[in-house]
């Protein structure tokens, strides 16, 4: 970079190197070049040559002010006209920053995704603060009032093997930079109820082509948790509100979900599971699409022959991994 | 011709128990989700709850939940509402119906359910 | 919860004449709304199911319509068998919700 260079002088930020975005700056430029008495002192930001605001203190010295800076990142360097000298001569550099102190950090949320070994915890950040922040992550036990302190940039894996101090703790996040340092407010968890389950996944899909196709949704989890409430929501590809459909449900059975749906038409499905009466939902699994087949001709017998919703052709889609061969395109 | 027939209604205290039957026929009962729908004096519907077709997930209302179980023996063509800790807010008529979601094409005569002391 | 009001408790017409009864949901529901028709002494019996369309063996003078929250059952041509409390039912969100329920008397 810019600092790594040889100087024959020094520059240097007024406030601060690192400063709050949109502040008044003065950048100070000190030649001390052998046998040169400057007739001229330069300032470059990201090498183009600034023109105006800069002022001759004195014989070697020269300030560049900049009002409500506003770049996040910038290189500064200076130079000197020296007599007898046919080029400008370097006299030195610096990388300069603006940015914003840390926001509280706040929505602090710290869950344990089935068989994954880890406590995973997230926070907002707030606003971005253009310069480096890091984040300390304080955890404390309840029961043994023992306290691990974890850095990072941004979220953390916290084996929970290393979570030693029983059931119940407390956890809250530090944020600080350059420009200043906040905390947020303390998260109290127990293990037990912050444990999502292994994801749940929709493998396949078909549709029995009857008086009123009915289609049937294969999906399954591989999780051990005994208690599990999911969701199911589906919509037409071309409508914007989602219809939900709720189960509490036992992963010893193949998951089974039965919709009338409109025929001719695709439809997207998603589901998503958590412990039951627990805080936390997996996310919504990858996007299911199926197309229900066109009706058959209505029949019109008086009394409507239920057993006729389960026969007749099927329309399957399949999914290959996450996605499906029916998988593709975009929700309209 | 579908058929739906409960069962098992009848008079019971504030806290007492009772077991809905609903006797499936004229369709394909193991392969529909099924539900319990019931009918207040005031002529309210509420879904109370609901099975998947091979048992593996229900639904329950919360004011019912922990109080009422939904279960089904598909060898039996039987759906079934196991019912505890009865209120007198439970008073209503109790239809079985299929299939049970998302709407309810077909419904039983239904079974009375008084709690009462 | 989704709550389904049926503002008319009660709805007077006459044989031969058409009635429109309404529902209106708490919030957008889409098109996932159904009604029923329940005559005195007996079960409900679905009629209309995705807003508009209608249940087999149902006559085709009723008719569904409407999105989101504002949902309408038309009954053309009323006949005398038409005497019945009629419920609609979202099935958008659980808990799935029902009307009130609107009381059709015929003159």
């Known amino acids: 970079g810019i600092t790594n260079i040889n100087c024959s002088g020094h520059i240097w930020v007024e406030p601060a190197t690192i400063f709050k975005m949109g502040m008044n700056i003065s950048i100070y430029c000190q030649a001390a070049i052998k046998n040169c008495q400057p007739r001229k002192l330069h300032f470059y930001k990201n090498g183009i040559k600034e023109r105006f605001q800069i002022t001759r203190i004195n014989k070697t010295t020269a300030r560049l002010w900049y009002k409500n800076f506003l770049e996040p990142h910038a290189s500064m360097y200076c130079t000197a006209e020296c007599p007898k000298h046919f080029q400008e001569t370097l006299i030195c550099g610096k990388d300069i920053s603006s940015g914003y102190p840390p926001d509280i950090p706040d929505e602090v949320t710290c869950v344990i995704y089935e068989y994954s070994g880890n406590m995973t915890c997230t926070w907002n950040a707030g606003k971005l603060t253009y310069i480096d922040t890091k984040y300390v992550v304080h955890v404390k036990s309840l029961e043994t009032e023992e306290e691990q302190q974890y850095l990072t940039s941004s979220y953390i894996n916290i084996s929970t093997d290393s979570l030693q101090g029983g059931k119940k703790y407390l956890v809250w996040v530090q944020a600080a930079n350059a420009l200043g340092m906040e905390e947020s407010k303390q998260l109290q968890i127990h293990l037990d109820d912050i444990v999502i389950p292994s994801a749940a996944v929709i493998s396949r899909a078909e549709t029995i082509n009857a008086t009123v196709p009915k289609t049937i949704i294969y999906w399954d989890s591989q999780t051990t948790i005994e208690k599990v409430s999911c969701e199911m929501r589906y919509k037409a590809t071309t409508n914007q509100t989602w219809n939900v459909k709720e189960f509490d449900t036992n992963f010893t059975y193949v998951q089974q979900s039965e919709f009338y749906l409109e025929p001719n038409i695709k439809y997207v499905f998603q589901v998503r599971c958590q412990e039951t009466g627990k805080r936390y939902w997996q996310p919504w699994s990858s996007l299911f699409f199926h197309k229900t087949p066109e009706t058959v001709p209505q029949v019109t017998s008086k009394a409507f022959q239920h057993d006729t919703w389960n026969s007749g052709l099927t329309v399957a889609s399949i999914s290959t991994g996450h996605l499906t061969s029916d998988n593709r395109g975009d929700i309209g | 011709e579908v058929k739906l027939v409960e069962s098992g209604g009848g008079l019971v205290q504030p806290g007492g128990s009772l077991k809905l039957s609903c006797a499936a026929s004229g369709f394909t009962f193991s392969s529909d989700t099924m539900s319990w729908v019931r009918q207040t004096p005031e002529k309210r519907l509420e879904l109370v709850a609901e099975?998947?077709?091979?048992?593996?997930?229900?639904y329950h209302i919360d004011t019912v939940k922990g109080r009422f179980t939904i279960s089904r023996d598909n060898a039996k063509n039987t759906l079934y509402l196991q019912m505890s800790s009865l209120k007198s807010e439970d008073t209503a008529m109790y239809y079985c119906?299929?299939?049970?979601?998302?709407?309810?094409?077909?419904w039983g005569q239904g079974t009375t359910v008084t709690v009462s002391a | 919860d989704i709550v389904m009001t049926q503002s008319h408790r009660f709805m007077s017409t006459s044989v031969g004449e058409r009635v429109s009864i309404t529902c209106k949901a708490s919030q957008d529901v889409g098109n996932a709304v159904a009604w029923y028709q329940q005559k005195p002494g007996q079960s409900p019996k679905l009629l209309i199911y995705?807003?508009?369309t209608r249940h087999n063996g149902v006559p085709d003078r009723f008719t569904g319509s409407g999105s989101g929250t504002d949902f309408t059952l038309t009954i053309s041509n009323v006949q005398g068998e038409d005497l019945a409390d009629y419920f609609c039912?979202?099935?958008?969100?659980?808990?799935?919700?029902f009307g009130s329920g609107t009381k059709l008397e015929i003159k």
């Open positions: 039912q979202q099935y958008n969100r659980y808990p799935l919700t």
């Open positions: 099975i998947s077709s091979n048992g593996g997930s229900t």
């Open positions: 119906a299929s299939p049970g979601y998302p709407w309810f094409a077909y």
């Open positions: 995705w807003t508009s």
